[in-house]
């Protein structure tokens, strides 16, 4: 007996040969002896019911005169999985269909950190193993259902499982998208007084996009985190709901998600939540967003610089005068120069010598009253 | 071709009413935005209100807001706007537009002419 | 509400010139930035969207650059049908607001 692979929903192709490699009289039939198509010498295809129903099974007429009388069997079912006979020169082959199918638990948009469910139907009497590859190449096996936890955006795009069953294979492809934002964390570094944009692009594209999203912000200085803004989001057109007075926020209109603060200033500086919470899906997106903003200062005879904001202990804090070395360099947010000498001063903030954030300041000669005799 | 025809301008005294609409062909009517956009004589373009595509939010500039209605109806392909409290400076040209799928009022009609006077 | 500022308000160019109009937003609007171009007793006619994109059958003659704060409208080679008003429209959020206007005449 023959066995053949099909996929539901895809065509299966069931081989009868002839020994003659000519056109001959062949007929398919189901086991119980139902006639499903053949060809009695005409060379004219003759089925064996209503159109209707038997409009998913055909032959290759070109392959006819070659001695091949395939039964193709199109948009496969789950019940197609049965014997199937071809009679032919006085015998009778019999060849074995077994349709599978493997489906994505519930959804194939599923949010970051969600688990992933695939499961594999097969026909009874059959014991495939199941393997699927992820698009990040790793590999997980199973019985008839395959589960991966903790989803990550590495793991959005097509998915491979290879269904094995009597040293045959039939290879699924489903397209899995992750939801999530491009970035799960971002900073920005910006001097007191300059304007700041907060950008929260996704990384997936829908053709319609509905939700509702809220930016909270736990500044620095603040005992408690505040609702900066809150927006809906429908199909993909972003519309603010309620905005703080201070800060004044200014929201755009279209994806990516786009937020515009006028001014940094020390007591904004701090770290921000965005959640997204996208209609017909548990569970929200989320990005951290940081702010960090520098002061420089000079107040009587001290020169003064401060950063405000969630800094990493290695970054450095140095006061230097322009195109010197460094006056005073520290693992500190808040650093100063007494008596600094006249020219441009610069404050600056970096990381393994790359800077992140500068900030210049003229000192201006100080004129001292010469003291009389 | 994507059309679209403004109908309903005219003279009005102060604190009148007045309600435009505008005829869209072409296109797909439902699912764009579609705006009112105005031009006072010899001066530059001022946006007046947008309602977005079958949502149905809606949008108005602050000289306007509480005074006019932007609506549409979309079995009819027609985009209205509703003017109450009509003041002298709501005098202009009034274009209809609509939006692209980019958000961009890409199309505009050749604009009926309101007239607030006593 | 954000502001728009274009500059020049009006210039005077011969047919061939390359003309540049700049347009100024009062905070950052990334590329949601538009250009419309009015002839007089007419409706305004849309040329370039996203501060780049040239709107289908615009002559290639128009380009478009800028991103934030600052935006560029640039005819390379003035024909006579460009004597025209160009206006910048921010398109970043509500209320949408468009530049004064630049005048585009003939030397």
């Known amino acids: 007996k023959t066995l053949v692979l099909g996929k539901e929903g895809e065509s299966a192709e069931l081989p009868c040969e002839s020994s003659q490699k000519k056109i001959t009289v062949f007929t398919w039939k189901f086991s119980d002896q139902r006639k499903i198509l053949g060809q009695h010498g005409k060379g004219v295809l003759i089925r064996g019911g209503s159109p209707s129903q038997f409009d998913r099974f055909d032959s290759k007429k070109g392959a006819w005169e070659k001695g091949s009388f395939p039964l193709i069997i199109n948009k496969l079912k789950m019940e197609d999985s049965q014997t199937y006979i071809c009679e032919l020169e006085n015998r009778k082959e019999e060849v074995e269909l077994w349709v599978f199918k493997v489906t994505a638990n519930s959804d194939t948009h599923l949010l970051q950190g969600q688990s992933l469910t695939l499961t594999l139907e097969s026909p009874p009497g059959s014991s495939p193993s199941v393997q699927c590859r992820s698009p990040r190449g790793k590999n997980i096996q199973g019985g008839k259902t395959l589960s991966v936890s903790q989803l990550e955006l590495q793991d959005s795009g097509t998915w491979t499982c290879t269904v094995l069953q009597n040293q045959k294979k039939v290879e699924f492809k489903i397209d899995i998208v992750v939801l999530a934002f491009q970035k799960a964390s971002s900073i920005v570094y910006k001097k007191e007084g300059e304007q700041v944009e907060f950008s929260f692009p996704l990384a997936f594209t829908v053709e319609k996009l509905t939700g509702s999203g809220e930016l909270w912000w736990q500044a620095e200085r603040a005992s408690s985190s505040k609702s900066w803004i809150t927006f809906d989001l429908k199909n993909k057109e972003v519309s603010v709901k309620r905005v703080t007075q201070d800060p004044k926020l200014q929201m755009g209109k279209k994806l990516p998600l786009h937020l515009t603060l006028p001014q940094a200033l020390p007591q904004y500086a701090g770290s921000g939540n965005l959640t997204l919470a996208l209609e017909a899906k548990t569970g929200k997106l989320h990005q951290e967003v940081n702010l960090v903003v520098m002061r420089a200062t000079q107040l009587q005879k001290n020169l003064t610089c401060e950063v405000w904001g969630p800094t990493s202990p290695k970054l450095m804090l140095s006061l230097k005068l322009e195109n010197k070395e460094a006056k005073v360099s520290k693992r500190e947010k808040a650093v100063w120069v007494l008596n600094p000498e006249a020219g441009m001063w610069q404050c600056l903030l970096s990381d393994s010598g790359q800077v992140l954030l500068e900030s210049n300041i003229k000192v201006l000669p100080t004129w001292s009253t010469p003291v009389q005799p | 071709e994507v059309q679209l025809l403004e109908s309903g301008g005219g003279l009005v005294q102060p604190g009148g009413s007045l309600r435009l609409s505008c005829a869209a062909s072409g296109f797909t009517f439902s699912t764009y935005a579609m705006s009112w956009v105005r031009q006072a004589p010899g001066k530059g373009l001022e946006w007046v209100s947008t309602i977005s595509d079958n949502i149905g939010n809606t949008y108005y500039a602050d000289s306007v807001k509480g005074r006019f209605t932007i609506s549409r109806d979309n079995s009819k392909n027609t985009l209205y706007l509703q003017m109450n409290s009509l003041r002298a400076e709501d005098t202009a040209v009034y274009y209809c537009?609509?939006?692209?799928?980019?958000?961009?009022?890409?199309?505009w009609g050749k604009g009926t002419t309101v007239t607030v006077s006593s | 509400a954000i502001q728009m500022t274009q500059s020049p308000s009006s210039l005077s160019a011969s047919v061939g010139d390359r003309v540049t109009i700049t347009c100024r937003a009062s905070?950052?609007?990334?590329?949601?930035l538009g250009w419309c171009q009015q002839k007089p007793g007419k409706a305004p006619k849309f040329l370039i969207y996203?501060?780049?994109t040239l709107q289908s059958g615009v002559p290639s003659r128009f380009s478009g650059s800028g991103y934030g704060t600052d935006f560029t409208l640039t005819i390379s080679s003035l024909q006579p049908e460009d004597f025209a008003t160009y206006y910048c429209?921010?398109?970043?959020?509500?209320?949408?607001?468009f530049g004064q206007g630049t005048k585009v005449e003939i030397k």
């Open positions: 537009t609509k939006d692209n799928e980019d958000y961009y009022m890409d199309v």
């Open positions: 905070q950052g609007i990334r590329n949601d």
């Open positions: 429209l921010q398109d970043y959020n509500y209320p949408r607001t």
């Open positions: 996203a501060a780049s």
